[in-house]
Each structure stands twice: as structure tokens, then as C-alpha cells.
Interface confidence: low
């Protein structure tokens, strides 16, 4: 015959665990239901009565099975440097993500808690490393026979074109310029641009039971804004 | 840096009051995190006190000895725990720890202590 | 409250030693345990949660077991910078505070 399943709330054999989506309760000592994701406990369970769940409240969530008597506060607005990519719901918090141009300078569990503006290399440097979701745009001078004449978070040092007969030189921040005879052989025919980082919702993943890869050591103070690196602008 | 820093402890009198803070730096004291006080005599164990969950009105959850003389207050727009202790006895004296608790069930239990602060009740 | 009763109160070991303390609830906190290390003038400092699971950071010598009323801290191989005084906590998280959160006496271990 098959083992009767027993209904919450019930007795634990001793030794064993209360099964998947219910949890212990110390003062009835029973196992009892938790409640779903997108509501709290209402009333907690006793002897005779399981837990009593009740909806989350607008701004609130819970996004796991538990039997927590509130549930969370939906993280505050995005800030105007970011993009909501995840609404707040009873089932999910609140995600920002930093819109484009801009990269995360402080992470949190999910989502952004402080975007900073990529870096543009001013003329005369271009893009060594470009910028991410998490890190900032790197500016390298640009190397003999190579120049970059804007300022930008994306472009790279471009090599000088190759005249017949050259009227000006090229330097780090300006092309070669060629006698009106047309120049034998252009390296660089346009600016060449490296792809702007997108943000995207980070990927979710479920907290585990030791979340102290997440709250006890991923919260950092926000740093004040870093001078400018060599060879870049704050525009 | 993630800390707690406590303050507020010193000598009061038998019978008198202290009012002990806890700011909290490096997180976010919103409603995903509750907070406890925890105490230790001189040369003595740990001590749990009460705990209050997230939300600023409560509810809150004392030691059996705690009730009715200790009170624990938050306001989260201050990143502040408070613990309010009245009718002060020599027996209170110690040192008292601000402890950050995770307040779902991530199983983040008393993962963030102050470095106490000392409360000395003597006349 | 529930009480937690905590043994032996010290004991003296050499390095290299396996070390083990006790952990004893007045009624079943099923798996809600804690274990503590506390070195003096220091807060102390979280070793192991939910009766067995290491917490971040911390050596795998560190190992807990029990569940319900009867729990365990193993050291397998003691180090110098282990003698320090062990707690106990019954912390069943959300809704076991409306019963508390009591500790153990500590076990202080101490060089032999």
C-alpha cells in the first residue's frame, strides 16, 4: 500500500524534514505550509490550523515560497541614468539597469544601484578597451600614425591616410592631409566605432541559502566620482 | 564598508536610562533586513535581547528578562536601530551589539555584528 | 524561552587536535542552529547556519551536524587561530523570534 501523505500541518518523524514548500514551525512543532511567492503569512500555523497566507501589498513582493508575516519593499524608483527592466510586482522586485552610454559603477544583487557615464577619449586618444554593463571605457594615446579626432566613449585610433604627396601631416588628433592629388591608398575610410554596450537585465538567479556571496560581502559604499583618466573627458 | 557602529553606552546610575544607537553604513536598512541587540556581561556569554522586523512600527520580539524595561525602535530613513533600556540594574552591564539579521528565508542569520558599545550601570 | 545548553563550558587542546562541542535545546528548533566563534574584545563571528551549512569564508575544518534538540560543532584539525570561545544559537529566522533567539553558555577552547 503507499505510505499515506500526510497534510499540513502534521508531526515531522523525528530526524527527518518537513518537505519541499513547507517549513518548521518551532512553537506548534509541525511542519506547515509556506506560503507561494507573491504572498506572506497572515496568521501562523498552529497545532490544528495550517498558515494562513494573505497577498502581497502594492510595492511589496515576496518572490520566494516563505512565511515571512511582511512581505519586501520593492526597491525605490529608477534613477534617470537607468532603465527599469524589471517592474515591480507581488512576485518580483523592482530591477534597474543603466541605460545606454552609461555603466555600472555599483552593482547589487540584481540590477544597478549606481550608473556612472562612459568615458569619451578626447581627441588624440582612442577606445583601448571598450566600456560594458559593469565596466567604464579605457583611453589609450593614440600610437604614431594613428589619430582620433573626436570625442567619444567609441571610437578607436584610426591609422593616417597614405597620400602621394602629403600637404599636412597627420598627427595623434588630426589626419593626414593629401595635395589635391587623391591619396594612393586610405587605411580608414570612415570612423570605425566599437559597439556601444547595452544594458540588459542581469540574469536572475535564486538566492541560495547562503546569501552571504550576496548581502553580508556584495554591498560596497558608493565611491565619489574618480578624476578623469589621462587622455579622457567627463562631457 | 558593510558595518554597524553602535553608541550611546557609558556609566548610568541604578534605576536610570540610556538610549543606544546602531547606524547601519554600506547597505540598505530598508524592510529587507531586521534587526537585533545581543549583549554580553563582562567575562560572560552572549546574551540575545530582541529583535524588531523591518517595518518602522514593529512588531518587535524580546528576551522573556527584557520585556516591560527594553525597547527596540528603528528609523530606516536614518539607518538607525535604537534600544531604549529604563529601570537600569548592575546586571545590565555590558557590552551590547547591534546585529543585522536577514529577515526572509535565505538562512542569513546574525551575519553582521557591531563592535559593541559598553554600558556600565554602577553608582 | 527556549534554553540552550552548551558543553563542555572549556576544554584544552593541541594544535592538530579534533575538537568537538555540544549543543542541546530544551525543545526541537528542528535545523535552525548557529554556531558562533568569539575572540576576545572581538564581535563574534558567524561559522556554520541551519545546523551544518559553512558560512562564506569559513574553513571547511569547520562542520556542524544534529537536528531537533541535539547539535554538534566538529573542528577536525584544530589551528592556532581557533582558540577562541564557541557559541550556540537556536535562530530558526522569520517567525522563531516570537520564541527568541537564546545562546549557549560558550565552550572556551584553550591551548593545552
Known amino acids: 500500500l503507499p505510505a499515506q501523505v500526510a497534510f499540513t500541518p502534521y508531526a515531522p518523524e523525528p530526524g527527518s524534514t518537513c518537505r519541499l514548500r513547507e517549513y518548521y514551525d518551532q512553537t506548534a512543532q509541525m511542519c506547515c505550509s509556506k506560503c507561494s511567492p507573491g504572498q506572506h503569512a497572515k496568521v501562523f500555523c498552529t497545532k490544528t490550523s495550517d498558515t494562513v497566507c494573505d497577498s502581497c501589498e502594492d510595492s511589496t513582493y515576496t518572490q520566494l515560497w516563505n512565511w515571512v508575516p511582511e512581505c519586501l519593499s520593492c526597491g525605490s524608483r529608477c534613477s534617470s541614468d537607468q532603465v527599469e527592466t524589471q517592474a515591480c510586482t507581488r512576485e518580483q522586485n523592482r530591477i534597474c539597469t543603466c541605460r545606454p552610454g552609461w555603466y555600472c559603477a555599483l552593482s547589487k544583487q540584481e540590477g544597478c544601484r549606481l550608473c556612472a557615464p562612459l568615458r569619451k577619449c578626447r581627441p588624440g586618444f582612442g577606445v583601448a578597451r571598450p566600456g560594458t554593463e559593469t565596466s567604464d571605457v579605457v583611453c589609450k594615446p593614440c600610437a604614431p600614425g594613428t589619430f582620433s579626432n573626436t570625442t567619444s566613449s567609441t571610437d578607436i585610433c584610426r591609422p593616417h591616410q597614405i597620400c602621394n604627396v602629403v600637404a599636412i601631416p597627420g598627427n595623434a588628433s588630426m589626419d593626414a592631409v593629401c595635395t589635391s592629388t587623391s591619396p594612393t591608398r586610405s587605411m580608414a575610410p570612415g570612423a570605425v566605432h566599437l559597439p556601444q554596450p547595452v544594458s540588459t537585465r542581469s540574469q536572475h538567479t535564486q538566492p541560495t541559502p547562503e546569501p552571504s556571496t550576496a548581502p553580508s560581502t556584495s554591498f560596497l559604499l558608493p565611491m565619489g566620482p574618480s578624476p578623469p583618466a589621462e587622455g579622457s573627458t567627463g562631457d | 564598508e558593510v558595518q554597524l557602529v553602535e553608541s550611546g553606552g557609558g556609566l548610568v546610575q541604578p534605576g536610570g536610562s540610556l538610549r543606544l544607537s546602531c547606524a547601519a553604513s554600506?547597505?540598505?536598512?530598508?524592510?529587507?533586513?531586521?534587526m537585533c541587540w545581543v549583549r554580553q556581561a563582562p567575562g560572560k556569554g552572549l546574551e540575545w535581547v530582541g529583535c524588531?522586523?523591518?517595518?518602522?512600527?514593529?512588531?518587535?520580539y524580546y528576551a522573556n528578562w527584557a520585556k516591560g524595561r527594553f525597547t527596540i525602535s528603528r528609523d530606516n530613513s536614518k539607518n538607525t536601530l535604537y534600544l531604549q533600556m529604563n529601570s537600569l540594574r548592575a546586571e545590565d552591564t555590558a557590552v551590547y551589539y547591534c546585529v543585522r539579521d536577514r529577515y526572509d528565508d535565505y538562512g542569513d542569520y546574525f551575519n553582521l555584528w557591531g563592535q559593541g558599545t559598553l554600558v556600565t550601570v554602577s553608582s | 524561552d527556549i534554553q540552550m545548553t552548551q558543553s563542555p563550558s572549556s576544554l584544552s587542546a593541541s594544535v592538530g587536535d579534533r575538537v568537538t562541542i555540544t549543543c542541546q535545546a530544551s525543545?526541537?528548533?528542528?535545523?535552525?542552529l548557529s554556531w558562533y566563534q568569539q575572540k576576545p574584545g572581538k564581535a563574534p563571528k558567524r561559522l556554520i547556519y541551519?545546523?551544518?551549512t559553512l558560512a562564506s569564508g569559513v574553513p571547511s575544518r569547520f562542520s556542524g551536524s544534529g537536528s531537533g534538540t541535539d547539535f554538534t560543532l566538529t573542528i577536525s584539525s584544530l589551528q592556532p587561530e581557533d582558540f577562541a570561545t564557541y557559541y550556540c544559537q537556536s535562530n530558526s529566522g522569520v517567525n522563531g523570534n516570537r520564541y527568541g533567539n537564546a545562546f549557549g553558555g560558550g565552550t572556551k577552547v584553550e591551548i593545552k
Open positions: 524588531i522586523y523591518p517595518s518602522i512600527v514593529g512588531p518587535t
Open positions: 554600506g547597505f540598505s536598512f530598508t524592510n529587507n533586513y531586521y
Open positions: 541551519y545546523a551544518s
Open positions: 525543545q526541537s528548533i528542528y535545523n535552525y
